[in-house]
Amino acid sequence: QKPSIGKCSVDIQQNRTKTTERPDLLNCPIYWQQVQEKCLLFSHTVNPWNNSLADCSTKESSLLLIQDKDELTRTQNLIHDKAISFWIGLNFSLSEKNWKWINGSFLSSNDLKITGDAKENSCVYISQTSVYSEYCSTEMKWICQKELTLVRNKVSPDSWL
Amino acid sequence: QKPSIGKCSVDIQQNRTKTTERPDLLNCPIYWQQVQEKCLLFSHTVNPWNNSLADCSTKESSLLLIQDKDELTRTQNLIHDKAISFWIGLNFSLSEKNWKWINGSFLSSNDLKITGDAKENSCVYISQTSVYSEYCSTEMKWICQKELTLVRNKVSPDSWL
C-alpha cells in the first residue's frame, strides 16, 4: 500500500554546511546571454514543451517567465528571423481554465495577448512579433532563463541549508 | 498563421557582460540542505508531478535525479515519517515503454526497484523505505536538487556570456 501524504518531518540538522557568503551568478555561462537581470539561452534545436521544460530544469534554469510587455519586447528584439518560434514557461491549466506560468502565477489580462486556442494541451510560444498558443506536443525551439543576481547573499546560521 | 520552425539567428553580440571569474554554488541556499555534492529542497506543500517539475525549474533546479542505490538510501534517511511521499524526476515514457529520468536517461534494471504500474501517466515517488509509481496527477510533496559545484570556472574573455 502506498504511503499517505502527511506532514513533513525531514531531518535537516545533520546536513548543515558552514555559513559562508554565497557568491551568486556574476555573469552568464557560455552559450547564454545577459538581458538585464537574466541570463537567457535560446535553443537551436527543437523539443515539445514538456521536454523543453525538462531541459531547462536539468540546466538548473527555468523556461522563460515574462514579467511585462517591456520584457516581452526586449526578448523579441533578440529574435532576428520572423520564422522562428520559442516555447516559454506558460501553458493552459484545464482545471483552472486559465493561462498559467510555470511558477504558478496566472496570466493577467493586461499582460501578453495570446493568439490561438486556450484549451487542454495548449502551450505558449513567442515569435519576433507575436505570442501564440500551440499544441504542447509540437516541436519548437525554447528559451531558458537564469536569474542574474549580483548581490552576495549572507546565509543565516540558523536557517536550513 | 504560425511561424514555421526554421533556422535560428538570435543576436548574441549586443549583450556581452564583462568577463569575471564566475563563482559557482559554494554552499546551499537557505531552506536547502547539502547531501554530498547536491543541495536538496524537500517541499512542504503538495503538487502533481508536472507542477513539481515546474516548481523545481523556477527555482533553477531539477526534480531529484538518483544515481544509484547509495544515493537513494542517503535521501531516504532524511525522511523521518513513514507516511510521507516525495516525487522524484522519473516517469514512464509511453513511446519508449520505459522509465525515464527527466535528463533523458532510462532507468537501468539494477537501479531502483519500483513498486506499482509501469504505464501511461505513471510517475515515481520515494518514501522512507520504498520507491513507488503513482498517477502523475496525484498531489504529493517533491524534492528539488541543485548540483553543488565547488570549482570556480573561468569564463573565457572572448566567449559569449
Partner: antibody, heavy 121, light 107 residues
Framework: EVQLLESGGGLVQPGGSLRLSCAAS????????MSWVRQAPGKGLEWVSA????????YYADSVKGRFTISRDNSKNTLYLQMNSLRAEDTAVYYC??????????????WGRGTLVTVSS | DIQLTQSPSSVSASVGDRVTITCRAS??????LAWYQQKPGKAPKLLIY???SLQSGVPSRFSGSGSGTDFTLTISSLQPEDFATYYC?????????FGGGTKVEIK
C-alpha cells in the same frame, strides 16, 4: 563509457541502398539532437543530416535531400541513416556525432569511429 | 548556405612555432563557430566552441578568437602531436557547414 559506434557500411552499386546504424552509450541519448557527417576520401567534412532529440524534426543537406532518411530509436539508443539511390559521390566515411549541449545541433564533442560506404559498380 | 573559407589551406611549421589559422564566414555568424582537429584515419576532435571556449581536456596552447565573420585558431607553441588537419564549423544557421580544412605539416 561514453561512445558512438557506427555500423552498416560496405560496398554497394549505384542506385542501391544501405542502412547505417549508430549505437550510443554512456550519455542521455534521447536528450540530444544527433547528426551524420561524412568525409569523402582525401576530402573535407560535410554535414549530411540532423534529427531532434524526440525525432520529430529532421534536416538534410541539399546533396542528399529526398534520398536519405535520418531516424532514431531512443529506447534502443540508436541513430539510423537510410540511404537510397546511392551515387558514386556518396562514397565516404560516415560519422555520427553528438553536440556538446542538448540545446544545439552542433559543436560536436563526441564522434563515432566512422563506417565506410563505397558506391561503385 | 553559409560558406566558410579557411586560410591557408596548408602550412609548414616547426615544433615550438606559433601557428595561426583563419576562418571567414560568408555572412555574420556571431560567435557560433567551432574548431576541430583531425588526424589521418581518425574522427575529428572538438578543440574550441563558441568561437573562443576551450573544450575540456584540450591543451591551453590552443585558443580561438573572433566574432561576426572573421575567426582565428592559434596554436601558441606547436607540439609534435599537433600536426594534423584543422576544420572550422558554423552552427549559426542550418545547414551546418565546415571550412575546407587547413593541414599543418612538419617543415
Amino acid at each position: 563509457e561514453v561512445q558512438l559506434l557506427e555500423s552498416g557500411g560496405g560496398l554497394v552499386q549505384p542506385g542501391g541502398s544501405l542502412r547505417l546504424s549508430c549505437a550510443a552509450s554512456g550519455f542521455t541519448f534521447g536528450t540530444f539532437a544527433m547528426s551524420w557527417v561524412r568525409q569523402a576520401p582525401g576530402k573535407g567534412l560535410e554535414w549530411v543530416s540532423a534529427i531532434s532529440g524526440v525525432g520529430g524534426t529532421t534536416y538534410y543537406a541539399d546533396s542528399v535531400k529526398g534520398r536519405f532518411t535520418i531516424s532514431r530509436d531512443n529506447s534502443k539508443n540508436t541513430l539510423y541513416l537510410q540511404m537510397n539511390s546511392l551515387r558514386a559521390e556518396d562514397t565516404a566515411v560516415y560519422y555520427c556525432a553528438k553536440p556538446l549541449d542538448s540545446s544545439f545541433w552542433a559543436d560536436f564533442d563526441l564522434w563515432g569511429r566512422g563506417t565506410l560506404v563505397t558506391v561503385s559498380s | 548556405d553559409i560558406q566558410l573559407t579557411q586560410s591557408p589551406s596548408s602550412v609548414s611549421a616547426s615544433v615550438g612555432d606559433r601557428v595561426t589559422i583563419t576562418c571567414r564566414a560568408s555572412q555574420t555568424i556571431s560567435s557560433w563557430l567551432a574548431w576541430y582537429q583531425q588526424k589521418p584515419g581518425k574522427a575529428p576532435k572538438l578543440l574550441i566552441y563558441a568561437a573562443s571556449s576551450l573544450q575540456s581536456g584540450v591543451p591551453s596552447r590552443f585558443s580561438g578568437s573572433g566574432s561576426g565573420t572573421d575567426f582565428t585558431l592559434t596554436i601558441s607553441s606547436l607540439q609534435p602531436e599537433d600536426f594534423a588537419t584543422y576544420y572550422c564549423q558554423q552552427q549559426s544557421v542550418l545547414p551546418i557547414t565546415f571550412g575546407g580544412g587547413t593541414k599543418v605539416e612538419i617543415k
